[in-house]
């Protein structure tokens, strides 16, 4: 996920809409002026925001990489939400990339867990149950299997 | 406790500039997220500028975009806000002020109007 024009955009154009700030705060989909004195609208499909604020400027909107599909897209209130592509995830150690889920468990363990957008299929132990630690077995050690279907969008 | 310290300001002509500095004590100066407001008489206090604890992010008013510039100085625990080309309508107290609870997205530092500890003000007058 990448952030779009990192560099600060003018806001307050003559047709955003405007209001009062209640309370000091703009509520979500809008930011406050450089004065306080008024709530602007943010931009649909560039930037937004999700709570009541004091912001001098709505968050940006952020793009889907290569890799990743998007699920919604950006509106004032809501960032996009981008999911990994069917056979790929994303850790949670690791969430600016999203990578490969593994084939096949390692001799000796069985799949207990497909894989999905933010997990690795998960291989167990036969005997012991316990989890294995998973880096990529070399191919003669792999017993295959085919990626599982992204389930539901992970937020 | 953050404190500010300013400098800097006076009196100075049209078409002039001035550089304001704002010095921090009390915290470590690289965690801080900064912003210089001002305020007119009888006017409400208006954002300037701000800048990210590691100056990648900065953001500026409409109005003072390409005449103003904000900067940092990590090691010297000080901002600074240059001004050039100085109009009668920039004449108002100056504020530093800090986040004690920034917000961040996707890395990138938002500021916001309601920033938290203030230093004591400046005043800038510009002559026609």
């Known amino acids: 996920i990448t952030q779009q024009d990192l560099a600060p955009q003018q806001r307050a154009a003559p047709q955003q809409k405007r209001s009062s700030p209640s309370e000091g705060l703009c509520p979500p989909g809008h930011h406050i002026s450089e004065d306080g004195r008024d709530c602007i609208s943010c931009k649909y499909g560039q930037d937004y925001s999700t709570h009541w604020n004091d912001l001098l400027f709505c968050l940006r909107c952020t793009r889907c990489d290569s890799g990743e599909v998007e699920l919604s897209p950006c509106t004032t209130t809501r960032n996009t939400v981008c999911q990994c592509e069917e056979g790929t995830f994303r850790e949670e150690d690791s969430p600016e990339m999203c990578r490969k889920c593994r084939t096949g468990c390692p001799r000796g363990m069985v799949k207990v867990g497909d894989c999905t957008p933010w997990s690795d299929i998960e291989c167990v132990h036969k005997e012991s149950g316990t989890k294995h630690s998973g880096e990529v077995p070399a191919v003669e050690e792999t017993v295959t299997s085919s990626p599982g279907t992204p389930a539901s969008p992970c937020s | 406790e953050v404190q500010l310290v300013q400098s800097g300001g006076g009196l100075v002509q049209a078409g002039g500039s001035l550089r304001l500095s704002c010095a921090a004590s009390?915290?470590?100066?690289?965690?801080?997220?900064m912003g210089w407001f001002r305020q007119a008489p009888g006017k409400e206090r208006a954002f300037v500028a701000a800048?990210?604890?590691?100056?990648?992010?900065?953001y500026y008013a409409e109005s003072v975009k390409g005449r103003f510039t904000i900067s940092r100085d990590n090691a010297e625990n000080t901002m600074y806000l240059q001004m050039n080309s100085l109009k009668p309508e920039d004449s108002a107290v100056y504020y530093c002020?800090?986040?004690?609870?920034?917000?961040?997205?996707?890395?990138?530092?938002?500021?916001?109007?309601?920033?938290?500890?203030w230093g004591q003000g400046t005043q800038v007058t510009v002559s026609s």
């Open positions: 800048i990210s604890r590691s100056g990648d992010n900065i």
């Open positions: 002020a800090v986040e004690s609870q920034p917000t961040y997205s996707g890395g990138v530092y938002y500021p916001r109007y309601g920033m938290d500890v």
């Open positions: 009390g915290s470590t100066f690289s965690s801080l997220d």
